[in-house]
């Protein structure tokens, strides 16, 4: 059984009258760190963006979307090499003539800065300062994301020891 | 069944070259980087190259650069080994090496049996 | 490149003993290490990964620890099979690098 492919998860007490409910415990796959609510695998090796799209996808994932300008400052954050640079879930739709997340929506004007050209087969990638458009048949790491789900788990309280 | 098989070994006279394939099956080969491995007569391991899973980065080890490359064809799920100006030093166990993940390079939890490399007039 | 440095080079250990491998990095690594069993005329074989993670189908008397740079894999109470030959590796950076391999022999 792979490490990555496990669901992230959020063990809390939803009924608080039931002791034996474990308290606040948040926990992300093996590789996995967690970002608010996100788990996050940044990998190491290097693929195209529709590899890396489909690695994603086989770890039951998506490549990161990116909210706002806040969660990109906290994913740039975690990246401690001023050379190193991650697909991200962002590529250009040439019928659409506009920059589109893998979950449909279009980039709004206000929430990333791409330097690069708009244009067929450009995919986006960000460094630890900036976001950036390259060919998407460029290889280069990537990093996938999951949201944190909820799960119930019951336990004795003894085991909290 | 999921395994990895060397062949290409063999003895060669200094500055002399070969050729080494590994054959993978049973998992999705193309989604992996791989590696060779290799390991002297009694001594420790040492990671000798990468190639990415579409084949177009590679990276070698310092005592290799220049004198061997690693490729691959996915469509026959092989990896390649191919050894020029041979040294006696180089003389090994060659081993093939698939990563835990497919998003890393190491963490090998797939070896094949090694085929050996023997440098020497 | 990061080095690993394992100690001891050997050691003598009978069934039954608890023996300790330690692995240091010339920098830090985060958790981004493992440990290989190796026995002659074989195939490493993958025991832990992500410094402190039992590889599927190994014996839980392995365990793996550590963080950063000093890492320790330990075998609580030693088998027959266990007598081997133990490598760690670092998976942070390329170039990939094994430390030099700790021998647990029979007392």
């Known amino acids: 059984q792979k490490p990555s492919i496990g669901k992230c998860s959020v063990d809390i007490q939803q009924n608080r009258t039931k002791t034996t409910e474990r308290p606040d415990l948040l926990n992300c796959p093996i590789y996995w760190q967690q970002v608010q609510e996100k788990c996050l695998l940044f990998s190491h090796t290097v693929n195209p963006w529709n590899n890396s799209l489909a690695d994603c996808s086989t770890k039951e994932s998506s490549l990161l979307l990116i909210q706002d300008k806040d969660e990109l400052t906290r994913t740039q954050n975690l990246i401690h090499d001023k050379a190193i640079s991650f697909w991200i879930g962002l590529n250009f739709s040439l019928s659409e003539k506009n920059w589109k997340w893998i979950n449909g929506s279009f980039l709004s004007s206000n929430d990333l800065k791409i330097t690069g050209d708009a244009k067929e087969n450009s995919c986006v990638y960000i460094s630890q300062t900036s976001v950036y458009s390259e060919y998407c048949s460029t290889e280069m790491k990537w990093i996938c994301q999951k949201e944190l789900t909820l799960v119930r788990n019951k336990v004795s309280p003894d085991s909290w020891l | 069944e999921v395994q990895l098989l060397e062949s290409g070994g063999g003895l060669v006279q200094p500055g002399g070259s070969l050729r080494l394939s590994c054959a993978a099956s049973?998992?999705?080969?193309?989604?992996?980087?791989m590696s060779w491995v290799r390991q002297a007569p009694g001594k420790g391991l040492e990671w000798v190259s990468a190639?990415?899973?579409?084949?177009?980065?590679?990276y070698y080890a310092d005592s290799v650069k220049g004198r061997f490359t690693i490729s691959r064809d996915n469509s026959k799920n092989t990896l390649y080994l191919q050894m020029n100006s041979l040294r006696a030093e180089d003389t090994a166990v060659y081993y093939c090496?698939?990563?835990?993940?497919?998003?890393?390079?190491?963490?090998?939890?797939?070896w094949g049996r090694g085929t050996l490399v023997t440098v020497s007039s | 490149d990061i080095q690993l440095t394992q100690s001891p080079s050997s050691v003598s250990a009978s069934v039954g003993d608890r023996v300790t491998i330690t692995c240091r990095a010339s920098?830090?690594?985060?958790?981004?290490l493992a440990w290989y069993q190796q026995k002659p005329g074989k195939a490493p074989k993958l025991l832990i990964y992500?410094?402190?993670s039992l590889q599927d189908g190994v014996p839980s008397r392995f365990s793996g620890s550590g963080s950063g740079t000093d890492f320790t894999l330990t075998i609580s109470s030693l088998q027959p099979e266990d007598f081997a030959t133990y490598y760690c590796?670092?998976?942070?950076?390329?170039?990939?690098?094994f430390g030099g391999g700790t021998k647990v022999e029979i007392k």
């Open positions: 090496a698939k990563p835990l993940d497919s998003s890393l390079w190491a963490d090998f939890d797939l």
């Open positions: 049973g998992f999705a080969f193309s989604t992996y980087a």
């Open positions: 190639i990415s899973g579409v084949g177009g980065t590679t």
């Open positions: 920098q830090g690594i985060s958790s981004w």
């Open positions: 992500y410094a402190s």
């Open positions: 590796q670092q998976a942070s950076v390329l170039p990939i690098t």
